[in-house]
């Protein structure tokens, strides 16, 4: 039995920040769970972890230097990533693991979300030509 995960196919981080919502076919509220976000086709980089236990506060952390926060919904976890760099444009995969009560459950691999990080471009003020002199 696997949990199904839905993610947006693509998100654009215009201001170097993005909200990525992972929607699960499973209610997490009465479970001890570990939701994580992974970067790359091979999911090699664990970007952010949200650890939840119904009786305690959420724990959110990154061991890979990402600036992240997380919020829990009934059947979703939203990862808020900030201070992203252009070179962190990549595909990101949501993962969910239900640790307790048993049995252990995890998800079918999702299609992932391409996060396109747009660099901050300072737009110069348009130059208006002054009054023409004879």
């Amino acid at each position: 039995n696997k949990i199904l995960v839905k993610q947006s196919p693509m998100l654009v981080a215009y201001d170097n920040a993005v909200n990525l919502s992972c929607k699960y076919s499973y209610n997490l509220f009465s479970r001890e769970f570990r939701a994580s976000l992974h970067k790359g086709l091979d999911s090699a980089v664990e970007v952010c972890v949200v650890y939840g236990n119904y009786s305690q506060q959420l724990q959110v952390y990154s061991k890979t230097g990402f600036n992240c926060d997380g919020k829990l919904g009934n059947e979703s976890v939203t990862f808020y990533l900030q201070n992203l760099y252009v070179n962190q444009t990549d595909i990101y995969f949501c993962k969910i693991e239900v640790m307790y009560p048993p049995p252990y459950l995890d998800n079918e691999k999702s299609n992932g979300t391409i996060i396109h990080v747009k660099g901050k471009h300072l737009c110069p003020s348009p130059l208006f030509p002054g009054p023409s002199k004879p």
């Epitope: 209610n27 009465s30 059947e75 048993p102 049995p103």
Partner: antibody, heavy 116, light 107 residues
Framework: LQQSGAELVKPGASVRLSCKAS????????IHWIKLRSGQGLEWIGW????????QYNAKFKGKATLTADKSSSTVYMELTGLTSEDSAVYFC??????????????WGQGTMVTV | DIQMTQSPASLSVSVGETVTITCRTN??????LAWYQQKQGKSPQLLIY???HLVEGVPSRFSGSGSGTQYSLKITSLQSEDFGNYYC?????????FGGGTKLEIK
């Protein structure tokens, strides 16, 4: 879930009740135990997970009930010790199913009557 | 531990009538609640899980509602086979306490 037959026991004695599972993978489901005393309501005793031998007890039944299992026979056991008239009841086992993150007990044994 | 307060403890109603049984908890259980029917000498039967979801095969005259700390089981057009005891049970951590039960008698 097939439960063992009725038991008539003396005060202070112990008894072991069994709950034999069939028709599903034994190690993938939690088994709960519930007590029903005559004229009273259902009382939750605890649960046992055969996959990892995880156990949860109601604090009220710690020292009274001990849950174990035998994977080879797909059977969960509950031993009750130091029996008194208060332990005279029907004891049910029930399988916990996970409905996408919500729990319930859809499958129950027929119950075992214990008379002290 | 979560306390379950079920009411009424008993009620006597006529066939065709509608009854509502309520279950209150002392803290939010986020709809992690089930309802069971038990007839004399039989095992309990699951009617509703997740507070509102009807189990397959259970007549549609049974319905569950509620959220937070207050939940209800409603039986419309009561039939003679609906007599027996009804229990709520929470699954918000352990112990998975049952309500005290409601004895439903047919007038």
């Amino acid at each position: 879930l097939q439960q063992s037959g009725a038991e008539l026991v003396k005060p202070g004695a112990s008894v072991r009740l069994s709950c034999k599972a069939s028709g599903y993978t034994f190690t993938e489901y939690i088994i709960h135990w519930i007590k029903l005393r005559s004229g009273q309501g259902l009382e939750w005793i605890g649960w046992f997970y055969p996959g990892s031998n995880d156990i949860q007890y109601n604090a009220k039944f710690k020292g009274k009930a001990t849950l174990t299992a035998d994977k080879s026979s797909s059977t969960v056991y509950m031993e009750l010790t130091g029996l008194t008239s208060e332990d005279s009841a029907v004891y049910f086992c029930a399988r916990r199913d996970d409905f996408s993150g919500y729990d319930a007990l859809p499958y129950w044994g027929q119950g075992t009557m214990v008379t002290v | 531990d979560i306390q379950m307060t079920q009411s009424p403890a008993s009620l006597s109603v006529s066939v065709g009538e509608t009854v509502t049984i309520t279950c209150r908890t002392n803290e939010n259980i986020y709809s992690n609640l089930a309802w069971y029917q038990q007839k004399q000498g039989k095992s309990p039967q699951l009617l509703i899980y997740a507070a509102t979801h009807l189990v397959e095969g259970v007549p549609s005259r049974f319905s569950g509602s509620g959220s937070g700390t207050q939940y209800s089981l409603k039986i419309t057009s009561l039939q003679s086979e609906d007599f027996g005891n009804y229990y709520c049970q929470h699954f918000w951590g352990t112990p998975c306490t049952f309500g005290g039960g409601t004895k439903l008698e047919i007038k």
